[in-house]
């Protein structure tokens, strides 16, 4: 019995769902009577589910698994794998036995897109040219482990005093930190770029350093200018500094974050003490380092309705404000692939293809191209769809008349993580059917 | 049964280049974190390298630029290049499989080490 | 990086005696990436206890991992034969990977 899964392992985001594609051809005549189908790890050999005496036996993995019931009796024994996890990733085998037997593997690859990364400025205040400074870059929940990359403005890769740490937390994610030191010139941009391996994500940030001295007079309060990008569901830190002169104390200082826009009240620090959050529970200063003028907010579990400008009043004696912008952002995920009609091809068909990648945010572009990478424009429709989270499912359509083979590529682009999710698909050979049947 | 075969130690001199091989069977190679890990003649153990299943490699620093990981996962075999070898290089070295998250990662699996010298 | 300091370097037991090794570090390490390993003379390390307290297949029963933080330890609560080994602890929560420099644990 041939059984048939993918050769190239199956990519799977942390927390979406992933589809095990397993098939094999009955014969007329097959009944779900005669079939014994059982998903297992191919390592340890751990029962996942199981089909047998014409039933479902049900998920033995955790509760997370899931056949497809009505697919069965066409040969279809692929496995549904629920809210996965970095502990899922690995080879699952697939035994399929009607009278005679036969069983293949899949591979699943666990995958999660890295934030855009953070940027600190060690010293950050009073940088005079030939000062070295620390520039720390920090991107958040990845996995697996990330490359990091650092450039100067013209692009020249900077390779010499660059530490760079991975830290796993309790899902099995990383966080990478990595530190470049350098040594100041009149002015000067710095870049990272954080790349997961599987995804092929790169998430980028830069700082330009402008060395001088900082002017006098009112509070000077300083924020990043880029905004702050943050994913769904993480938290956020939204910078803002000041100053202290000597002899500062946290009675002195009044503290107000509030939106820039509705100038609805976020949070505020008044009095000597922290007065707590007005912004849905969810915000926190960090007291231990007001004191030395760390202004910053701490945004947690952020929703896409958060995104916007936050305002940063401080007042000692005198008084100063500026304005921290947030970007939200949501990875989409690795686009599907749909063909109609599917079967029976043949050249001069004309074939709808459907590209579908879900709950990003901000909206996608879509981008599709042929073979050669000669970008594929007339013909294509897309939609972005808004859930209720505010989170878009994207789906293109492209219109092709078909050649004798041919290769079409959809890239579902993030415009602020500048993350590129890619599917494919080959129509070749005449007449076929996809996708393509044992 | 779990076996993890290095293979290509042996006595080379100062500024010399080494090829470390190690065949693995008993497990689905390609779906596993890869590393080597040595042991000095103190035995102190310190990881060298690691290698993701599609290929992406980490290395630690003492070595970076002068090892190369890699892995054929059609054959099951997992590589480290040496070159500019220096006598602090001289260890025991032992291909590892990296475990996944369910056991946290720990380093489940080690094989018999081959051993590499560099003296003039 | 993170420094792994296990004390002691070299310690000798009498067969049926309770045993207790420590493991230090530098900076604080996520009790679930903290792991112990094993080896004798001649042979390669063997995993032995993962995640702080978690025994790996067929490591007896009388052995007992805990700790949190920066200190971590592993116990054995009546010394046999078989235990005299070399123990290594181990951290996977912040590259680079780092090793203890092993305690030696003897018969007396």
């Known amino acids: 019995l041939e059984v048939q899964v993918p050769e190239d392992p199956v990519v799977a985001l942390v927390g979406t769902d992933a589809t095990l594609c397993c098939s094999f051809s009955p014969e007329p005549g097959f009944s779900l009577a005669q079939l014994n189908l059982i998903w297992q790890l191919t390592d340890t050999k751990q029962l996942v589910h199981s089909f047998a005496e014409g039933q479902d036996q049900g998920s033995a993995y955790a509760n997370r698994t899931a056949l497809f019931p009505d697919l069965l009796a066409q040969g279809n024994a692929s496995l549904r794998l629920q809210r996965v996890r970095v502990a899922d990733e690995g080879s699952f085998t697939c035994f399929v036995s009607i009278r005679d037997f036969g069983s293949a593997a899949v591979s699943l690859q666990v995958a999660a897109p890295y934030s855009k990364p953070s940027m600190t400025l060690e010293p950050n205040k009073d940088l005079r040219p030939g000062d070295t400074v620390t520039i720390t870059c920090s991107s958040y929940q990845g996995y697996p482990e990330a490359e990091v990359f650092w450039q100067d403005g013209q692009g020249v890769p900077l390779t010499g005093n660059v530490t760079t740490s991975q830290m796993a937390n309790e899902q099995g994610l990383f966080d990478v930190h990595s530190i470049l030191r350098v040594v100041l010139g009149a002015n000067g941009t710095y870049s990272c770029l954080v790349r997961n391996p599987v995804l092929q994500q790169d998430a980028h940030s830069s700082v330009t350093i402008t060395p001088q001295r900082s002017p006098t007079g009112a509070v000077e309060v300083q924020v990043p200018e880029d905004p702050v990008v943050a994913l769904v569901g993480t938290d956020a830190t939204l910078r803002c500094s000041f100053s202290p002169e000597p002899g500062f104390s946290l009675a002195q200082l009044n503290l107000i974050w509030q939106l820039t826009d509705t100038k609805q009240l976020v949070h505020s620090f008044t009095e000597g003490r922290d007065q707590g959050s007005a912004y849905a529970n969810r915000t926190a200063l960090f007291p231990d380092l007001l004191a030395q003028g760390n202004a910053s907010l701490r945004l947690q579990r952020v929703r896409v309705a958060d995104e916007g400008s936050f305002t940063c009043f401080v007042s000692i004696r005198d008084f100063g404000s500026a304005a921290v912008s947030l970007q939200v952002a949501a990875p989409y995920s690795k686009p599907s692939m749909t063909l109609e009609p599917n079967k029976d091809l043949r050249p001069g068909d004309t074939v709808t293809i459907t590209c579908s990648s879900y709950r990003g945010y901000p909206e996608a572009e879509v981008f599709w191209q042929d073979g050669q990478g000669v970008p594929l424009t007339g013909n294509v429709t897309t939609s972005q769809m808004a859930n209720e989270q505010g989170l878009f499912d994207v789906h293109s359509v492209l219109r092709v008349v078909l050649g004798a083979n041919g290769t079409y590529s959809c890239l579902v682009r993030n415009p602020v993580l500048q993350q590129d999710a890619h599917g494919s698909v080959t129509i070749t050979g005449q007449p076929m059917t996809f996708p393509p049947e044992a | 049964e779990v076996t993890l075969v290095e293979s290509g130690g042996g006595l080379v001199k100062p500024g010399g280049s080494l090829k470390l091989s190690c065949a693995a069977s008993?497990?689905?190679?390609?779906?596993?974190?890869m590393s080597w890990v040595r042991q000095t003649p103190e035995k102190r153990l310190e990881w060298v390298a690691s290698i993701l299943s599609g290929g992406t490699s980490f290395y630690a620093d003492n070595v970076k630029g002068r090892f190369t990981i890699s892995r054929e996962n059609a054959r099951n075999i997992l590589y480290l290049q040496m070159s500019s070898l220096k006598s602090e290089d001289t260890a025991m070295y032992y291909c590892?499989?990296?475990?996944?998250?369910?056991?946290?990662?720990?380093?489940?699996?080690w094989g018999q080490g081959t051993s590499v010298t560099v003296s003039s | 990086q993170i420094v792994l300091t296990q004390s002691p370097a070299n310690m000798s037991a009498s067969l049926g005696e309770r045993v207790t090794m420590t493991c230090a570090a530098s900076s604080s390490v996520s009790s679930s990436y903290l792991h112990w390993y094993q080896q004798k003379p001649g042979s390669s390390p063997k995993l032995w206890i993962y995640?702080?307290?978690n025994l790996a297949s067929g490591v007896p029963g009388r052995f007992n991992g805990s700790g949190s933080g920066t200190s971590y330890s592993l116990t054995i609560s009546s010394m046999e034969a078989e235990d005299a080994a070399t123990y290594y602890c181990h951290q996977y929560h912040r590259s680079p990977w780092t090793f203890g420099g092993g305690t030696k644990l003897e018969i007396k």
């Open positions: 590892v499989r990296r475990y996944g998250h369910d056991r946290y990662y720990a380093m489940d699996y």
């Open positions: 008993g497990f689905t190679f390609s779906t596993y974190v």
């Open positions: 995640s702080t307290s």
